[in-house]
Interface confidence: low
């Protein structure tokens, strides 16, 4: 054997966010043929010899993280990426609204805000049958998810999750379903927006509030797939990760300005129609990466 | 030991404003919420708002807003409670009190003493 | 109107038990934790129960604390003349974002 053993992949199932007192199995698997699996928990260091944990009950001391390895002759693979175990219900759930109103003109904005009992610092938003969540640390007791201009795909079933920072794995039940319904076209789709239409997060507008990037999110892992109670599809707890949605717009506003490179070598006429029409196009601001 | 020393009865004339004040000491005054609970004579308890006092950040029960303004000076762990506009149902024993933890909402563990506020013309 | 509902008066002999219930919504009590408060003639409100069923330090165990989804309860025993006051009971409700307290109740040990 040449270099490590590939790593094996962890998954908790049905869920890696269970209910306190309901029960989850983590299985590890790697490849066929594995003489030892090791499987184990993180802070405070235990371990089992097996390719699975059963809990049959779970409890605020099972949250936290685990990875799992496997031994071949006496060759180590390499660790699993680390999942996360969250317990949730420990808190009162969180209440989630939708600013101005739940059903929203498709180009609009709109503000889904998770409100908890006060302090907690961190909130989840999740749409159902998406494979990301929207994470924003945030002091004080309430979260903004802002959507800036709606379209169809923002329509669906969201709720969210508040926890504190100092227990990352121990969170709230979660808040009452919140229906997100998109209507027909704004009225005014083609209206060049002014600053003060773009909707500004509640940190953003009042300094006095805490930075939201006080808090670390360095260890938070992006590939555990899991399912909220009460949720049948697959959910993930993959931040937002706004640098990257900004590559994807500088690309995309990459290629508009190369198709109108493109168009200078039409006729002149028909250029200058076009151009004009483009122009106005890329003066709105590109909408985010749907959520959904 | 932990204890909250509230500033004296007024007497206010209807329109006008008052200023109260709730003294902290004992413990870390940024460590904890503070809370204005307000108790009308022969009357129940209801809370006004808070105050988170590192931050200044403030939450006001929806019936006080804009009429109650919650500020706090970190230097003399100090929480001050204004209320404005003031009308003779205003009049009642204004009790400020420390939330018992950060993470949820647990309770009120210490309160101060009371400051009765009478408007009267 | 108070949100969380008290009765107003209860009322039980020296060494006896005496309960005080107190109800309310699944915005405050049924998904917060429930405070009750004393509040001897003339004074502050002092904790009494936090947590739902938690007892500060200083209070002694005839007091206790129950909840059961959108009601809690207090309970007294072994009444003493000193305990007679108003007690209130009291949640977070995360609906209109405040505190809500009940009524009050006057407890009165006789005799």
């Known amino acids: 054997q040449s270099g490590p053993l590939p790593k094996p992949s962890l998954q908790a199932q049905p869920s890696s966010l269970v209910p306190l007192g309901q029960s989850v199995i983590l299985r590890c698997q790697g490849p066929p043929d594995v003489d030892l699996y090791r499987l184990e928990k993180l802070k405070p260091e235990k371990y089992e010899d097996q390719d699975f944990l059963f809990i049959p009950t779970m409890e605020r001391s099972n949250a936290g993280r685990y990875r799992c390895s496997y031994q071949n002759g006496s060759h180590w693979s390499l660790p699993s990426d680390q999942l996360e175990l969250i317990a949730t219900g420990v808190y009162a759930k969180p209440s989630l609204s939708a600013h101005p109103s739940s059903a929203v003109p498709q180009g609009r904005d709109v503000t889904l805000k998770c409100q908890s009992p006060y302090s907690f610092d961190e909130f989840v938003l999740y749409k159902e049958g998406d494979t990301g969540s929207y994470k924003r640390p945030e002091k004080w007791y309430r979260a903004n998810f802002p959507i800036i201009t709606v379209t169809a795909a923002h329509s669906g079933t969201y709720r969210c999750y508040s926890f504190s920072s100092s227990s990352p794995y121990l969170w709230s039940a979660p808040s009452d379903p919140l229906v997100l319904v998109v209507t027909g076209l704004s009225a005014t789709p083609s209206q060049v927006p002014t600053e003060e239409s773009f909707p500004v997060t509640e940190s953003s507008r009042r300094p006095s509030i805490l930075p939201t990037n006080k808090i670390s999110t360095t260890e938070k892992p992006m590939n555990i797939t899991a399912s909220p109670e009460g949720l049948s599809p697959p959910f993930g707890f993959a931040h937002q990760h706004y640098a990257k949605g900004n590559l994807v717009r500088i690309c995309l506003g990459a290629t508009i300005i190369i198709i109108l490179l493109g168009l200078l070598a039409e006729d002149w006429h028909s250029r200058k129609k076009c151009l004009q029409h483009r122009m106005r196009a890329l003066q709105r601001p590109l909408p985010p990466l749907p959520l959904a | 030991q932990v204890q909250l020393v509230q500033s004296g009865a007024e007497v206010k004339k209807p329109g006008a404003s008052v200023k109260v004040s709730c003294k902290a000491s004992?413990?870390?005054?940024?460590?904890?919420?503070m809370h204005w609970v307000r108790q009308a004579p022969g009357q129940g308890l209801e809370w006004m708002g808070l105050i988170e006092p590192s931050e200044g950040e403030t939450e006001y029960a929806q019936r006080f807003q804009g009429r109650v303004t919650m500020t706090r000076d970190t230097s003399t762990s100090t929480v001050y409670m204004e209320l404005s506009s003031l009308r003779s149902e205003d009049t009642a024993v204004y009790y400020c009190a420390r939330d018992s933890s950060r993470s949820y909402p647990l309770g009120f563990d210490i309160w101060g003493q009371g400051t009765l506020v009478t408007v009267s013309s | 109107q108070s949100v969380l509902t008290q009765p107003p008066s209860v009322s039980a002999a020296p060494g006896q038990k005496v309960t005080i219930s107190c109800s309310g919504s699944?915005?405050?009590?049924?998904?917060?934790?429930v405070s009750w408060y004393q509040q001897l003639p003339g004074t502050a409100p002092k904790l009494l129960i936090y947590?739902?069923?938690k007892r500060p330090s200083g209070i002694p165990d005839r007091f206790s604390g129950s909840k059961s989804g959108t009601s809690a309860t207090l309970g007294i025993t072994g009444l003493q003349t000193e305990d007679e006051a108003d007690y209130y009971c009291a949640a977070w409700d995360f609906r209109s974002s405040r505190w809500v307290f009940g009524g009050g109740t006057k407890l009165t040990v006789l005799g």
């Open positions: 947590d739902n069923n």
């Open positions: 004992g413990y870390t005054f940024t460590s904890h919420y």
């Open positions: 699944s915005s405050n009590i049924g998904n917060n934790y």
